[in-house]
Interface confidence: medium
């Protein structure tokens, strides 16, 4: 069997919540199954065409209603042929959108005045991927690259900070990460707390 | 002309086997799937599962695996649907469903459907 | 398993908007279908891949889809199209479908 994926050239950029649609030609076979594979997995999908073009000609199609971040990687079609599995040239499809967090700013608790550490990254496709820190409604820090640390001197009241992840593609606002006052202990004193608190939380990917 | 003519209405009692049939003319059997499709008396449509006769791969609904088989016969372009021990919660009509693309010169194709006329099984002692 | 939800009933007077949903979680990544069928007939395909027309069916029948949620709209109801209506669509990894439970649409 002579396969080789048509219509689509080898690396496809799509952007994220649009369709796309793969297209895989088989020639020299009469009845194909044709099986598109997704980084080495048999892709499920029921509604998968296979269209005769003529007699030892066949197109099948692989119909993604919506891409997000977990569709990107390598494609290929594969057929049987005499107990042999030829497989295609691959597809790599690369999802672009706006920033995804990776880690985010943390609660803390802190003594008055301490200096403390924020932590924020994101990243794309597309890169780069530059981080604003804001300090309630005001902006306070950046533009700068993912990821980025923001370094507090200290604070006096609880107080919200949260970064805001900009690419090509737009802008995506991190949570909100609220920073206590932590009571300090009768006859020590505020200043004397030199250690920094780190944060570097991170959660897992979200399915759209 | 493109038609899929299964088998007659059929009467069981509990227990029994049966396997009823939808003969698909008109088109190359081979190049798409078909599907079964329940409806109980009165009831909504419930997708039992499909076949793709060229390569007998098969796909079920929860509900239905490991309950019904599917089968297709690529010489006689036939697909069958078939129970071991049938239950009273069988009786419904049972349809075959072939959906179909065209394309206009190559393009994105267009999707049609043939449904089959419909097979009422019922099982009763 | 997979479920997707529609209204038992739907009632329009004729002339007036109909709008039919089917939610699903599921719905943001599947096409959704939907189908007609009259009493004692077989289903008949009205809308495939959201918002696409089948074949000979009247323009006044109208999909879309929109996060978790798709209809169907039939937009000067007429007296003909009282008619069960199901949506239909696959679970998240595409290995199984499932149709909805039904909408019955009177047109008094």
């Known amino acids: 069997a002579g396969l080789k994926l048509m219509g689509a050239p080898v690396k496809l950029t799509v952007s994220q919540g649009q369709p796309v649609k793969l297209n895989c030609s088989v020639e020299g076979m009469e009845e194909p199954d044709i099986q598109w594979v997704k980084d080495g997995a048999v892709v499920q999908n029921l509604d998968q065409l296979y269209i005769p073009v003529s007699e030892q000609h066949w197109i099948g199609f692989l119909s993604l209603k919506s891409v997000e971040r977990s569709d990107a990687g390598r494609y290929w079609c594969q057929v049987e042929d005499g107990g042999e599995t030829e497989i295609s040239q691959p597809v790599w499809l690369t999802v672009e959108g706006v920033p995804f967090f990776t880690v985010e700013p943390k609660d803390l608790a802190v003594p008055p005045n301490a200096p403390f550490q924020l932590s924020c990254e994101a990243v794309g496709p597309p890169e780069p991927v530059t981080i604003v820190w804001w300090r309630g409604t005001t902006k306070i820090g950046g533009p700068a690259p993912s990821p980025s640390v923001l370094n507090v001197t200290g604070v006096t009241q609880s107080t919200m900070f949260s970064c805001e992840a900009h690419n090509l593609k737009g802008l995506a606002s991190s949570r909100t990460a609220t920073v206590h006052l932590q009571l300090v202990p009768r006859g020590s004193s505020a200043h004397h707390h030199h250690h920094h608190h780190h944060s570097a939380w991170s959660h897992p990917q979200f399915e759209k | 002309e493109v038609q899929l003519v299964q088998s007659g209405a059929d009467v069981k009692k509990p227990g029994a086997s049966l396997t009823i049939s939808c003969q698909a003319s008109g088109y190359t059997f081979t190049d798409y799937w078909i599907s079964w499709v329940r409806q109980k008396p009165g009831k909504g449509l419930e997708w039992m599962g499909q076949i793709v006769p060229r390569a007998s791969r098969t796909n079920y609904g929860p509900s239905f695996q490991g309950h019904v088989t599917i089968s297709a016969d690529r010489s006689t372009a036939t697909a069958y649907l078939q129970w071991r021990s049938l239950e009273a919660s069988d009786t419904a009509m049972y349809y075959c469903v072939r959906p179909y693309f065209q394309t206009s010169g190559g393009t994105i194709p267009e999707y049609y459907q043939h449904w089959g006329p419909g097979t009422l099984v019922t099982v009763s002692s | 398993s997979y479920e997707l939800t529609q209204p038992p009933s739907v009632s329009v007077s004729p002339g007036q908007t109909a709008r039919i949903t089917c939610s699903g979680d599921?719905?943001?990544?599947?096409?959704a279908y939907w189908y007609q069928q009259k009493s004692g007939q077989a289903p008949v395909l009205v809308i495939y891949?959201?918002?696409k027309r089948a074949s000979g069916i009247p323009e006044r029948f109208s999909g879309s889809s929109s996060g978790t949620m798709a209809t169907l709209t039939i937009s000067g109801a007429q007296v003909e199209d009282e008619a069960d209506y199901y949506c239909?669509?696959?679970?998240?990894?595409?290995?199984?479908?499932?149709f909805g439970g039904g909408t019955k649409l009177t047109v008094l």
């Open positions: 599921a719905l943001p990544k599947k096409y």
């Open positions: 891949e959201d918002e």
């Open positions: 239909y669509s696959q679970e998240r990894n595409g290995n199984y479908a499932v």
